[in-house]
Interface confidence: low
Amino acid sequence: AMFIVKNGNGTACIMANFSAAFSVNYDTKSGPKNMTFDLPSDAKVVLNSSSCGKENTSDPSLVIAFGRGQTLTLNFTRNATRYSVQLMSFVYNLSDTHLFPNASSKEIKTVESITDIRADIDKKYRCVSGTQVHMNNVTVTLHDATIQAYLSNSSFSREETRCEQDRPSPTTAPPAPPSPSPSPVPESPSVDKYNVSGTNGTCLLASMGLQLNLTYERKDNTTVTRLLNINPNKTLASGSCGAHLVTLELHSEGSTVLLFQFGMNASSSRFFLQGIQLNTTLPDARDPAFKAANSSLRALQATVGNSYKCNAEEHVRVTKAFSVNIFKVWVQAFKVEGGQFGSVEECLLDENNM
């Protein structure tokens, strides 16, 4: 959608054209919940809050409102040669029961973050790839963005500054044309280390590469299977420690949230991967908001105090349409002594290969 801020004499000083996806973590009475939603088509510029700024005293700002009290604000700043979105802030209203069902508090929250959105003066900022801005409990992903502030003639400049993600790196091939289903197999995902700590120390250590296997219907009614690698460099990990449940939450690009839940069988003193939940956005899907969950898994099992290790690729089927391929997994949940993996329990696949 296009958003424009004008000054008193009707001249545009900010123009922005983008779509945005939001991923928000919030608390419900039954535990933490994640909601993903897109900037709706009826989002509006808040004219009395947006501003072209005043010479040397204040900077331009674009304030976009939607729903019941949600506002996305882009605050711009400049020097002699460049301008940038110095700060992005998002105000969300947990009493908006459409967006945040069963929220345990009904307050208005504000989160903010600096951004990488910057361009040369008198050039527009252009980014076709997703631009993610991570804030506390919120990730905002801008797609297909054209943004320009400090406009001189009420229209986007012809020249542009492209975002880093859009520039082909020396090692990458140009983007492939749309592929028939199934998609070509991507290379194995990078392995990364994750740990979750609580008041009593570390409750989860994990080292693994993650690949999502998604089957969905596209807008043209064809069914496609895609393999998506979780890129550790573009992933934020968090989680929680509980007596009976340990969670690892991964926020990745494209407003992807992948949640692992580890449970424990008290009688046998074994931990296991009990649940996986995925929320992501698939722009070419008939229903772009892809959600899948299963909380009755029994994978990656080992005795509490030991670690589970598997060099072979493991496939964990979550639903008919979604499975997770886990590469080179080494994981330990609940009891982690000294921040180190304990005795290893190898997976059957590895033992059979020995």
Epitope: S49, R68, G69, N93, S95, D96, T97, K106, E107, I108
Partner: antibody, heavy 118, light 106 residues
Amino acid sequence: QVQLQQSGAELVKPGASVKMSCKASGYIFTNYNIHWVKKSPGQGLEWIGAIYPGNGDAPYSQKFKDKATLTADKSSSTTYMQLSRLTSEDSAVYYCVRANWDVAFAYWGQGTLVSVSA
Amino acid sequence: DIQMTQSPPSLSASLGGKVTITCKASQDIDRYMAWYQDKPGKGPRLLIHDTSTLQPGIPSRFSGSGSGRDYSFSISNLEPEDIATYYCLQYDNLWTFGGGTKLEIK
């Protein structure tokens, strides 16, 4: 805890204006809307409007948009409602209510009685 | 503004009996409906929100249902303290109260 302290009863003459206050405490003032509700024997409960003190934004009911003016003073955490060109129809108890659009977590003030009489 | 049409304006029922009040919205309010009890000299008391969710401390004799534009509120096993005026309130788009229903005991 959340409290809304409203100003005292007012006896005013027809044609005059009255300005009542609602002082908030026990929460972050700029995070919640303050709604105003009229309770009268003839008309029952009527929603007048609301103000979001964070930015002064104030939507009104169509019926009251020329009658009521809502303002907020962040420094004193106080919301004001001014009623103009008063008639006997405006005699009522006026409540301020802290709530975002959801009502389940609403807090009501004790009410301000306005009597319009010559 | 969304309009709320509440009926009946008044009703009379026997102790131990059951009454039902209805409210019709001028447009779909997506179950954002509440019911208040109002007594003279007191502030309004919220009984039900989100169409059917009882507020803490409200007896289960009170109930609500509905969807879209049509909503209803019932009190069963009527007691003397239920004598009051009852109002519906939509809060899907700003707020609008219904006209009220005055309940009397026969």
